[in-house]
Interface confidence: medium
């Protein structure tokens, strides 16, 4: 990957697609400046991930400018809270991990105000991008779907996420060509059954998403964004 | 700023077809990911779900209006479109169209509603 | 089909109060819930998608909680700009509303 970006200073709200190793590059916001003081964490930011709602710590090298990078890595994927969080990060930039647009963390408040830029015309948006989860490396990683429908990509998309039981009649309302692509589909769902079970109401995907350290290779991950490429939508419930 | 608007011809026979029209701007139905909502509501009643059009022309109906709808799109002039085929005086309604975006979100952005009314 | 039931149709509360709007899945909806404001002139806007997330531009009085079947909006320090009907609505299959809770003030 290019490490053009890498003398790449970024400030609190920015608004970047970040690299982690065996993920997509996802969409992101800068949630803490690195402070010096803090050796782990010594040149690295804090990212907050879209989607999933997880953070995280990475350098300069693995974060890249949200709006120069996104017609390059804002295709839609099948990871886990992927599209949604493209979704949130264009029209909804100061989302916090708990859902409550609240007050900033102290590390963002000493930063001048951050206006995102006005993506795709979304006029309604806030000024700097606000606090985050303060969980870190709690994500699980999301397995590739072995099982995929006849076109090769895997449906799920909002108004069809929910499983079915193996035996449930199709829905009357679904695309035509989809009855003979569900038997493909059972058994893969936008969260994991125990997350959503035992999740917060606040925080219903927590625990989804690119972890801080994550041992999957780029290979399989770069074949896995290959096969991702144009999913169709949520049919798996 | 996303903006929806919706027309249509306002008054029609039963039995006959009604074609309304959703012109947006600030997003594109070209864009992945992105879907156009129609969604109506007769007069004292509540929202009633009816179509969903996509990007990639995948589409999705009520299951109870089905054999009636058809949606298509105009991508170039940024226009998403509703077809009933045979409106019946049931299909009273305001008609409003939304975007809504691939994943785990809701309908965002809502046109201002057109209403349709269906008289002899 | 999902059901999706609002049992309570309307609800008068008084200004500053704080008022929760329930509604119940016919299913198991796996947090797949959105809830909708509709104005007096019929002006529709998203609130809260994925059962607890603030849209963008809502106040933070609005919240949402939930899970399985059972789901809730509050809001926690009514205003005048509030007096609309809300909805709630399911995408885990397909789109679905519930039948809409009008608030009014007392």
């Known amino acids: 990957m290019s490490r053009s970006n890498r003398q790449k200073e970024y400030k609190c709200g920015d608004l970047v697609f970040a690299k982690m190793k065996g993920y997509p590059h996802w969409p992101a916001r800068i949630d803490e400046m690195p402070e010096a003081a803090v050796k782990s964490t010594a040149n690295k930011y804090q990212v907050f991930f879209f989607g999933t709602h997880e953070t995280a710590f990475l350098g300069p090298k693995d974060l890249f400018p949200y709006e120069e990078s996104k017609e390059k890595f804002g295709k839609p994927n099948k990871r886990k809270g992927f599209s949604e969080g493209l979704w949130e990060i264009e029209n909804n930039p100061t989302v916090k991990a708990s859902g409550y647009q609240s007050s900033q963390k102290k590390s963002c408040a000493a930063e001048p105000e951050v206006e995102p830029e006005d993506h795709e015309g979304d006029g309604d948006k806030k000024g700097s991008a606000e606090g985050s989860s303060d969980e870190e490396g709690k994500l699980v990683i999301d397995e590739p779907a072995k099982e995929k429908n006849e076109k090769g990509t895997l449906k799920r998309r909002a108004g069809d996420v929910l499983e079915d039981s193996p035996k449930r009649p199709k829905e009357s309302g679904d695309h035509e060509e989809e009855d003979k692509e569900i038997a493909a589909l059972e058994g893969e769902r936008p969260l994991p059954v125990e997350v959503e079970k035992n999740s917060t109401p606040s925080e219903p995907d927590s625990g989804q998403g690119p972890p801080a350290e994550e041992e999957e290779g780029e290979e399989e991950a770069a074949k896995e964004e290959a096969e991702a490429q144009g999913v169709r939508d949520h049919e798996s419930l | 700023q996303i903006t929806l608007k919706q027309s249509g011809p306002g008054i029609v026979q039963p039995s006959q077809p009604v074609r309304l029209t959703c012109t947006f701007s600030g997003f594109s139905l070209s864009t992945s990911g992105i879907g156009v909502a129609w969604i109506r509501q007769p007069s004292g009643k509540g929202l009633e779900w009816l179509a969903t059009i996509w990007w990639d022309d995948d589409n999705r109906y009520n299951p109870s209006l089905k054999s009636r709808l058809a949606v298509s799109k105009d991508t170039s002039n940024n226009q998403a479109f509703l077809n009933i085929i045979t409106v019946e005086t049931a299909d009273t309604a305001i008609y409003y169209c939304?975007?809504?975006?691939?994943?785990?979100?809701?309908?965002?952005?809502w046109g201002q509603g057109t209403l349709v009314t269906v008289s002899a | 089909d999902i059901q999706m039931t609002q049992t309570t149709s309307s609800l008068s509360a008084s200004l500053g109060d704080r008022v929760t709007i329930s509604c119940r899945a016919s299913q198991d909806i796996s947090n797949y819930l959105n809830w909708y404001q509709q104005k007096p002139d019929g002006t529709v806007k998203l609130l809260i998608y994925?059962?607890?997330r603030l849209h963008s531009g809502v106040p933070s009085r609005f919240s949402g909680s939930g899970s399985g079947t059972d789901y809730s909006l509050t809001i926690s320090n009514l205003e005048p700009d509030d007096i609309a009907t809300y909805y709630c609505q399911q995408y885990g299959k397909l789109w679905t509303f519930g039948g809409g809770t009008k608030l009014e003030i007392k």
């Open positions: 994925y059962t607890s």
């Open positions: 939304a975007q809504i975006y691939d994943y785990a979100v809701g309908f965002a952005y």
